[in-house]
Amino acid sequence: CDLPQTHSLGNRRALILLAQMRRISPFSCLKDRHDFEFPQEEFDDKQFQKAQAISVLHEMIQQTFNLFSTKDSSAALDETLLDEFYIELDQQLNDLESCVMQEVGVIESPLMYEDSILAVRKYFQRITLYLTEKKYSSCAWEVVRAEIMRSFSLSINLQKRLKSKE
């Protein structure tokens, strides 16, 4: 499956929007750094079937969408930027869903890569727990925003590697 050219443009736009969501200087938040245990192995160049990679990427974007569409994120972040971010993520999800259908068919896709998808879900659970423990403070959001930018960049790199293998 060929992801459209607009997909990589959407990725870049989403990253730019994340960067623009900064509300306070990150220099004041150094002590709030946290190890969210990003599931690096799910994004490494192991013997990844393309369908598995697409499923993991889809889960990553879906969980990002969920994280930023809570009432707490709306209260903490710029709503105009969030709305634009949702649009970009929604388009990403649509592109990847079309790809999943083409690669493996609708029936087996949710179950085949359960471990990888679960690893991504647990990663986002850790992020949500951190925000809760930090009472959704400005610094907590700043740390999470930096983490999502990093994980999003790694997702983009995986997509680039998939494209280069075609």
Epitope: A19, R22, S25, P26, F27, C29, L30, K31, D32, R33, H34, D35, F36, E142, V143, A146, E147, M149, R150, S153
Partner: antibody, heavy 121, light 107 residues
Framework: EVQLVQSGAEVKKPGESLKISCKGS????????IGWVRQMPGKGLEWMGI????????AYSPSFQGQVTISADKSISTAYLQWSSLKASDTAMYYC??????????????WGQGTLVTVSS | DIQMTQSPSSLSASVGDRVTITCRAS??????LNWYQQKPGKAPKLLIY???SLQSGVPSRFSGSGSGTDFTLTISSLQPEDFATYYC?????????FGQGTKVEIK
């Protein structure tokens, strides 16, 4: 391969201005902060300040605030350290190093080779 | 500012010795401590980050421990290339601060 390449050694007179550089390559320059560290002859390491090249936000050590200016040009992946009026006590080796920002990753994992600044009349 | 105090300032040891350097912070820094090695005329090199994580490519004879205010760098069996100056640095809050350094010399 990640690299930070600093500009060459400088010999200046007291009162002169100076701008030294640190060019990053092999990684996304705007995804990491760049810190500057001073080492006076025969002495230890002193953190001077740091910049986020994505938006040029800076933080300085109180010891260096107002004495130096840190800046960056993300279009050419380069950070700068500058003085408007050098003093003999600014004679030192200056290092740049990259910092992961708020991400849980190694601090100052890559360093420039250093720029030796000598200020003498 | 958070003060970092290293001890000893210098030590003499032989190849094969177990060497321990300590670093104390003036207030709790959780596990936000890094250790660097510097050889004459060279840039510092990161050895340990977040108190106990070994930086990629660093030999396993180097290890770090501690949290709060007291930290230790251990070299389990000193090698000829380990004679250098070692610095601790807190990454808990700005301004970032380094210890004064510990010079490891040949006995």
């Amino acid at each position: 391969e990640v690299q930070l390449v600093q500009s060459g050694a400088e010999v200046k007179k007291p009162g002169e201005s100076l701008k030294i550089s640190c060019k990053g390559s092999g990684y996304s320059f705007t995804s990491y902060w760049i810190g500057w560290v001073r080492q006076m002859p025969g002495k230890g390491l002193e953190w001077m300040g740091i910049i986020d090249p994505s938006d040029s936000d800076t933080a300085y050590s109180p010891s260096f605030q107002g004495q130096v200016t840190i800046s960056a040009d993300k279009s050419i992946s380069t950070a700068y350290l500058q003085w408007s009026s050098l003093k003999a006590s600014d004679t030192a080796m200056y290092y740049c190093a990259r910092h992961p920002g708020l991400n849980w990753a190694p601090d100052f994992d890559y360093w420039g080779q250093g720029t030796l600044v000598t200020v003498s009349s | 500012d958070i003060q970092m105090t290293q001890s000893p300032s210098s030590l003499s040891a032989s190849v094969g010795d177990r060497v321990t350097i300590t670093c104390r912070a003036s207030q709790s820094i959780d596990g936000s401590l890094n250790w660097y090695q510097q050889k004459p005329g060279k840039a510092p090199k990161l050895l340990i980050y977040f108190a106990s994580s070994l930086q990629s490519g660093v030999p396993s004879r180097f290890s770090g421990s501690g949290s709060g205010t007291d930290f230790t760098l251990t070299i389990s069996s000193l090698q000829p290339e380990d004679f250098a100056t070692y610095y601790c640095q807190q990454s808990y809050d700005f301004p970032l601060t380094f210890g004064q350094g510990t010079k490891v010399e040949i006995k």
